[in-house]
Protein backbone atom coordinates (compact mmCIF):
# COMPACT_ATOMS: atom_id res chain seq x y z
CA UNK A 1 0.00 0.00 0.00
CA UNK A 2 0.95 3.63 -0.43
CA UNK A 3 1.96 5.24 2.86
CA UNK A 4 2.83 8.92 3.04
CA UNK A 5 3.22 11.75 5.52
CA UNK A 6 2.19 15.38 5.22
CA UNK A 7 2.75 18.45 7.39
CA UNK A 8 0.29 21.25 7.96
CA UNK A 9 -0.36 24.12 10.36
CA UNK A 10 -3.39 25.97 11.64
CA UNK A 11 -3.93 28.86 13.99
CA UNK A 12 -6.59 29.33 16.66
CA UNK A 13 -6.18 32.70 18.35
CA UNK A 14 -2.63 32.78 19.70
CA UNK A 15 -2.25 29.01 19.35
CA UNK A 16 -0.31 27.43 16.52
CA UNK A 17 -1.06 23.79 15.72
CA UNK A 18 1.62 21.82 13.89
CA UNK A 19 0.03 18.73 12.39
CA UNK A 20 1.70 15.57 11.11
CA UNK A 21 -0.70 13.40 9.09
CA UNK A 22 0.14 9.85 8.07
CA UNK A 23 -1.98 8.15 5.41
CA UNK A 24 -1.96 4.38 5.70
CA UNK A 25 -4.08 1.26 5.42
CA UNK A 26 -6.02 0.25 8.51
CA UNK A 27 -3.97 -2.89 9.07
CA UNK A 28 -0.71 -0.92 8.91
CA UNK A 29 -1.48 1.17 12.00
CA UNK A 30 -0.16 -1.36 14.52
CA UNK A 31 3.45 -0.64 15.43
CA UNK A 32 3.53 2.72 13.66
CA UNK A 33 4.90 5.78 15.46
CA UNK A 34 4.53 9.36 14.18
CA UNK A 35 6.86 12.03 15.56
CA UNK A 36 7.81 15.70 15.18
CA UNK A 37 11.38 16.96 15.41
CA UNK A 38 12.95 20.41 15.56
CA UNK A 39 16.39 21.40 14.28
CA UNK A 40 17.46 17.83 13.54
CA UNK A 41 18.80 17.34 10.05
CA UNK A 42 19.77 13.68 10.27
CA UNK A 43 18.85 12.24 13.65
CA UNK A 44 15.10 12.67 13.87
CA UNK A 45 13.80 9.72 15.88
CA UNK A 46 11.04 9.15 18.44
CA UNK A 47 13.71 9.49 21.14
CA UNK A 48 14.85 12.90 19.93
CA UNK A 49 11.40 14.20 18.99
CA UNK A 50 9.33 16.93 20.60
CA UNK A 51 6.28 14.70 20.55
CA UNK A 52 5.37 11.23 19.36
CA UNK A 53 2.18 9.30 18.73
CA UNK A 54 2.00 5.51 18.71
CA UNK A 55 -0.75 4.36 16.43
CA UNK A 56 -3.19 1.63 17.42
CA UNK A 57 -5.36 -0.42 15.15
CA UNK A 58 -8.96 0.76 15.45
CA UNK A 59 -11.31 -2.23 15.17
CA UNK A 60 -14.21 0.18 14.73
CA UNK A 61 -13.06 1.24 11.27
CA UNK A 62 -14.53 -0.96 8.57
CA UNK A 63 -13.07 -1.70 5.16
CA UNK A 64 -9.52 -1.77 3.92
CA UNK A 65 -9.35 1.75 2.48
CA UNK A 66 -6.74 4.32 3.28
CA UNK A 67 -7.12 6.13 6.62
CA UNK A 68 -5.23 8.99 8.23
CA UNK A 69 -3.72 9.37 11.68
CA UNK A 70 -2.72 12.75 13.07
CA UNK A 71 -0.21 13.96 15.60
CA UNK A 72 -0.98 17.51 16.70
CA UNK A 73 1.60 19.65 18.48
CA UNK A 74 0.14 22.85 19.91
CA UNK A 75 2.20 25.91 20.81
CA UNK A 76 0.12 28.26 22.96
CA UNK A 77 2.16 31.36 22.08
CA UNK A 78 4.85 31.37 19.43
CA UNK A 79 8.00 33.10 20.69
CA UNK A 80 11.37 33.78 19.06
CA UNK A 81 12.59 30.58 20.73
CA UNK A 82 10.31 28.57 18.42
CA UNK A 83 12.11 29.77 15.29
CA UNK A 84 13.73 26.83 13.55
CA UNK A 85 13.30 23.90 11.21
CA UNK A 86 10.72 21.21 11.87
CA UNK A 87 10.06 17.81 10.33
CA UNK A 88 7.29 15.25 10.59
CA UNK A 89 8.49 11.65 10.49
CA UNK A 90 7.07 8.18 11.01
CA UNK A 91 8.33 4.64 11.23
CA UNK A 92 6.92 1.17 11.53
CA UNK A 93 8.48 -1.30 13.92
CA UNK A 94 6.75 -4.13 12.07
CA UNK A 95 7.64 -3.42 8.46
CA UNK A 96 10.72 -1.23 8.97
CA UNK A 97 9.16 1.54 6.86
CA UNK A 98 10.58 5.02 7.56
CA UNK A 99 8.82 8.15 6.38
CA UNK A 100 10.31 11.63 6.40
CA UNK A 101 8.16 14.65 5.67
CA UNK A 102 9.37 17.85 4.07
CA UNK A 103 11.24 20.28 6.30
CA UNK A 104 9.22 23.35 7.24
CA UNK A 105 10.22 26.41 9.22
CA UNK A 106 8.88 28.84 11.77
CA UNK A 107 10.44 32.29 11.57
CA UNK A 108 9.68 34.84 14.25
CA UNK A 109 10.05 38.32 12.81
CA UNK A 110 11.24 41.61 14.30
CA UNK A 111 7.68 42.94 14.20
CA UNK A 112 6.47 40.29 16.63
CA UNK A 113 4.74 38.23 13.95
CA UNK A 114 5.82 34.85 12.62
CA UNK A 115 5.68 32.91 9.39
CA UNK A 116 5.47 29.20 8.71
CA UNK A 117 7.10 28.24 5.40
CA UNK A 118 7.82 25.05 3.50
CA UNK A 119 4.47 23.38 4.06
CA UNK A 120 3.40 21.42 1.01
CA UNK A 121 -0.33 21.82 1.57
CA UNK A 122 -0.31 25.59 1.82
CA UNK A 123 3.03 26.84 0.83
CA UNK A 124 3.22 29.90 3.02
CA UNK A 125 1.31 30.84 6.15
CA UNK A 126 1.83 34.21 7.77
CA UNK A 127 0.52 34.86 11.25
CA UNK A 128 0.09 38.15 13.03
CA UNK A 129 1.02 37.49 16.63
CA UNK A 130 -0.91 40.32 18.21
CA UNK A 131 -4.24 40.09 16.42
CA UNK A 132 -4.08 36.32 16.03
CA UNK A 133 -5.11 36.46 12.40
CA UNK A 134 -4.06 34.47 9.40
CA UNK A 135 -3.06 36.49 6.38
Amino acid sequence: GCINITSSASQEGTRLNLICTVWHKKEEAEGFVVFLCKDRSGDCSPETSLKQLRLKRDPGIDGVGEISSQLMFTISQVTPLHSGTYQCCARSQKSGIRLQGHFFSILFTETGNYTVTGLKQRQHLEFSHNEGTLS
Epitope: T14, K38, D39, E47, T48, S76, T79, P80, G84
Partner: antibody
Protein backbone atom coordinates in the same frame (compact mmCIF):
# COMPACT_ATOMS: atom_id res chain seq x y z
CA UNK B 1 13.73 12.70 36.68
CA UNK B 2 14.65 16.17 35.45
CA UNK B 3 17.58 17.70 37.29
CA UNK B 4 19.21 21.10 36.86
CA UNK B 5 22.31 21.81 38.93
CA UNK B 6 23.85 25.28 38.92
CA UNK B 7 27.44 26.04 39.87
CA UNK B 8 29.95 28.88 39.70
CA UNK B 9 28.42 31.32 42.15
CA UNK B 10 30.82 33.49 44.14
CA UNK B 11 31.52 36.81 45.80
CA UNK B 12 33.07 39.16 43.22
CA UNK B 13 34.01 42.82 43.05
CA UNK B 14 32.10 45.26 40.83
CA UNK B 15 33.44 45.30 37.29
CA UNK B 16 34.72 41.72 37.47
CA UNK B 17 33.47 38.63 35.62
CA UNK B 18 31.90 35.33 36.59
CA UNK B 19 30.66 32.31 34.65
CA UNK B 20 27.74 30.21 35.85
CA UNK B 21 27.06 26.67 34.66
CA UNK B 22 23.92 24.55 34.71
CA UNK B 23 24.25 20.79 34.25
CA UNK B 24 21.03 19.18 33.02
CA UNK B 25 19.90 15.56 33.12
CA UNK B 26 16.73 13.49 32.83
CA UNK B 27 15.47 14.92 29.52
CA UNK B 28 16.56 15.46 25.92
CA UNK B 29 18.49 18.66 26.57
CA UNK B 30 18.98 19.56 22.90
CA UNK B 31 15.19 19.80 22.40
CA UNK B 32 14.62 22.51 24.94
CA UNK B 33 15.21 26.23 25.13
CA UNK B 34 16.80 27.19 28.43
CA UNK B 35 16.78 30.28 30.61
CA UNK B 36 18.36 32.04 33.57
CA UNK B 37 16.06 33.73 36.09
CA UNK B 38 17.39 35.64 39.10
CA UNK B 39 16.09 36.73 42.48
CA UNK B 40 17.74 39.47 44.50
CA UNK B 41 17.72 38.91 48.27
CA UNK B 42 14.16 39.31 49.63
CA UNK B 43 13.00 40.44 46.17
CA UNK B 44 10.93 39.00 43.34
CA UNK B 45 11.82 36.98 40.25
CA UNK B 46 13.44 38.55 37.21
CA UNK B 47 14.03 36.88 33.84
CA UNK B 48 17.65 37.38 32.72
CA UNK B 49 18.23 35.52 29.45
CA UNK B 50 17.05 32.65 27.25
CA UNK B 51 18.66 30.52 24.58
CA UNK B 52 17.06 28.39 21.86
CA UNK B 53 17.43 24.62 21.82
CA UNK B 54 20.20 24.68 19.18
CA UNK B 55 21.93 27.70 20.68
CA UNK B 56 21.48 29.88 17.59
CA UNK B 57 19.17 32.44 19.17
CA UNK B 58 19.60 34.20 22.49
CA UNK B 59 17.63 36.94 24.23
CA UNK B 60 18.37 39.20 27.19
CA UNK B 61 16.65 41.63 29.51
CA UNK B 62 17.71 45.20 28.74
CA UNK B 63 19.72 45.70 31.94
CA UNK B 64 22.15 42.86 31.11
CA UNK B 65 22.44 43.29 27.33
CA UNK B 66 26.08 43.70 26.30
CA UNK B 67 27.32 42.45 29.69
CA UNK B 68 25.92 38.91 29.97
CA UNK B 69 26.21 36.10 27.43
CA UNK B 70 24.09 32.94 27.54
CA UNK B 71 25.43 29.86 25.78
CA UNK B 72 25.05 26.10 25.78
CA UNK B 73 26.92 22.91 24.93
CA UNK B 74 24.41 20.26 23.89
CA UNK B 75 27.09 17.57 23.84
CA UNK B 76 27.68 18.22 27.55
CA UNK B 77 24.01 18.88 28.46
CA UNK B 78 25.09 22.18 30.00
CA UNK B 79 24.12 25.82 29.69
CA UNK B 80 26.21 28.79 30.79
CA UNK B 81 25.89 32.42 31.76
CA UNK B 82 28.99 34.54 31.28
CA UNK B 83 28.61 37.68 33.38
CA UNK B 84 30.97 40.58 32.69
CA UNK B 85 31.17 44.12 34.10
CA UNK B 86 29.21 42.97 37.14
CA UNK B 87 27.31 45.54 39.20
CA UNK B 88 26.01 45.48 42.75
CA UNK B 89 22.45 45.26 41.37
CA UNK B 90 23.37 41.89 39.81
CA UNK B 91 23.59 40.40 43.30
CA UNK B 92 21.02 37.60 43.36
CA UNK B 93 20.33 33.90 43.39
CA UNK B 94 20.52 32.75 39.77
CA UNK B 95 18.22 29.92 38.74
CA UNK B 96 18.61 27.73 35.69
CA UNK B 97 15.22 26.90 34.15
CA UNK B 98 13.76 25.03 31.19
CA UNK B 99 11.29 26.56 28.79
CA UNK B 100 8.18 24.47 28.30
CA UNK B 101 8.00 23.96 24.55
CA UNK B 102 4.24 24.23 24.17
CA UNK B 103 3.75 27.10 26.61
CA UNK B 104 5.57 30.19 27.89
CA UNK B 105 5.93 28.84 31.41
CA UNK B 106 9.28 27.86 32.97
CA UNK B 107 8.60 24.28 33.94
CA UNK B 108 11.73 22.99 35.70
CA UNK B 109 14.03 25.00 37.95
CA UNK B 110 17.38 24.32 39.55
CA UNK B 111 18.04 25.05 43.22
CA UNK B 112 19.87 28.25 42.35
CA UNK B 113 23.36 29.63 42.92
CA UNK B 114 24.25 32.82 44.78
CA UNK B 115 26.17 35.63 43.09
CA UNK B 116 27.27 38.51 45.34
CA UNK B 117 28.78 41.63 43.78
CA UNK B 118 30.41 43.76 46.43
CA UNK B 119 33.66 45.59 47.09
CA UNK C 1 7.17 46.76 28.57
CA UNK C 2 4.17 45.13 30.21
CA UNK C 3 4.23 45.61 33.97
CA UNK C 4 2.48 43.16 36.30
CA UNK C 5 1.14 44.26 39.67
CA UNK C 6 -0.11 41.87 42.33
CA UNK C 7 -2.52 42.45 45.16
CA UNK C 8 -2.39 42.11 48.01
CA UNK C 9 1.36 42.31 48.66
CA UNK C 10 0.97 40.20 51.79
CA UNK C 11 -2.01 38.55 53.40
CA UNK C 12 -2.90 36.21 56.22
CA UNK C 13 -5.61 33.59 55.91
CA UNK C 14 -7.18 31.10 58.29
CA UNK C 15 -7.39 27.39 57.49
CA UNK C 16 -10.49 26.69 55.40
CA UNK C 17 -10.74 30.28 54.18
CA UNK C 18 -11.13 31.20 50.51
CA UNK C 19 -8.17 33.17 49.22
CA UNK C 20 -7.92 35.21 46.03
CA UNK C 21 -4.71 36.77 44.71
CA UNK C 22 -4.96 39.18 41.78
CA UNK C 23 -2.47 39.99 39.05
CA UNK C 24 -3.04 43.01 36.80
CA UNK C 25 -1.16 43.72 33.58
CA UNK C 26 -0.49 47.21 32.24
CA UNK C 27 -1.66 45.99 28.79
CA UNK C 28 -3.73 43.03 27.65
CA UNK C 29 -1.95 39.65 27.73
CA UNK C 30 -2.99 36.27 26.35
CA UNK C 31 -2.11 34.01 29.28
CA UNK C 32 -0.92 34.22 32.84
CA UNK C 33 1.20 31.68 34.68
CA UNK C 34 1.57 31.36 38.46
CA UNK C 35 4.44 30.01 40.59
CA UNK C 36 4.62 29.03 44.21
CA UNK C 37 7.81 29.65 46.17
CA UNK C 38 8.55 28.67 49.74
CA UNK C 39 11.45 30.12 51.77
CA UNK C 40 14.80 28.67 50.74
CA UNK C 41 13.32 26.80 47.79
CA UNK C 42 13.16 27.44 44.07
CA UNK C 43 9.87 28.49 42.44
CA UNK C 44 7.51 25.78 41.23
CA UNK C 45 5.10 26.21 38.33
CA UNK C 46 1.66 26.17 39.94
CA UNK C 47 -0.89 27.28 37.36
CA UNK C 48 -0.10 27.71 33.67
CA UNK C 49 -1.98 29.21 30.74
CA UNK C 50 -4.31 31.03 33.15
CA UNK C 51 -6.26 28.05 34.45
CA UNK C 52 -4.36 24.76 34.04
CA UNK C 53 -3.01 23.22 37.23
CA UNK C 54 0.58 22.00 37.12
CA UNK C 55 1.23 18.37 37.99
CA UNK C 56 0.68 17.61 41.67
CA UNK C 57 -1.14 20.86 42.48
CA UNK C 58 -4.22 20.25 44.68
CA UNK C 59 -7.57 20.93 43.06
CA UNK C 60 -8.49 23.49 45.72
CA UNK C 61 -6.40 25.84 43.56
CA UNK C 62 -7.85 27.45 40.47
CA UNK C 63 -6.90 30.21 38.07
CA UNK C 64 -8.96 32.53 35.91
CA UNK C 65 -8.93 35.82 34.07
CA UNK C 66 -8.42 37.47 30.71
CA UNK C 67 -7.11 40.68 29.20
CA UNK C 68 -5.46 42.66 31.97
CA UNK C 69 -6.91 40.97 35.06
CA UNK C 70 -6.05 37.48 36.32
CA UNK C 71 -6.46 35.69 39.62
CA UNK C 72 -5.36 32.65 41.59
CA UNK C 73 -7.90 31.25 44.05
CA UNK C 74 -7.53 28.76 46.89
CA UNK C 75 -10.90 27.36 47.90
CA UNK C 76 -9.99 26.00 51.32
CA UNK C 77 -6.74 27.41 52.63
CA UNK C 78 -4.39 24.84 54.16
CA UNK C 79 -1.18 25.36 56.12
CA UNK C 80 0.94 23.95 53.27
CA UNK C 81 -0.38 26.71 50.95
CA UNK C 82 1.52 29.37 52.88
CA UNK C 83 4.10 30.65 50.36
CA UNK C 84 4.83 33.51 48.00
CA UNK C 85 2.94 33.40 44.69
CA UNK C 86 4.23 35.08 41.53
CA UNK C 87 2.39 35.71 38.28
CA UNK C 88 4.28 35.69 34.96
CA UNK C 89 3.50 36.46 31.33
CA UNK C 90 5.21 36.57 27.95
CA UNK C 91 4.96 39.28 25.35
CA UNK C 92 7.14 40.65 22.60
CA UNK C 93 9.61 42.35 22.70
CA UNK C 94 10.07 42.52 26.48
CA UNK C 95 9.80 38.71 26.67
CA UNK C 96 9.20 37.33 30.19
CA UNK C 97 7.95 39.44 33.09
CA UNK C 98 7.01 38.49 36.63
CA UNK C 99 4.77 40.16 39.15
CA UNK C 100 6.30 41.36 42.45
CA UNK C 101 4.79 38.47 44.38
CA UNK C 102 2.12 37.98 47.04
CA UNK C 103 3.20 36.55 50.37
CA UNK C 104 0.45 34.36 51.82
CA UNK C 105 0.68 33.43 55.48
CA UNK C 106 -1.44 31.12 57.62
CA UNK C 107 -3.16 32.35 60.80
Amino acid sequence: EVQLVESGGDLVQPGRSLKLSCAASGFTFSNYAMAWVRQAPTKGLEWVASISNGGGNSFYRDSVKGRFTISRDNAKNTQYLQMDSLRSEDTATYYCATHNYESTVFDYWGRGVMVTVSS
Amino acid sequence: EIVLTQSPTTMTASPGEKVTITCRASSSVSYMHWYQQKPGASPKPWIYETSKLASGVPDRFSGSGSGTSYSLTINNMEAEDAATYYCQQWNYPSMYTFGPGTKLEIK
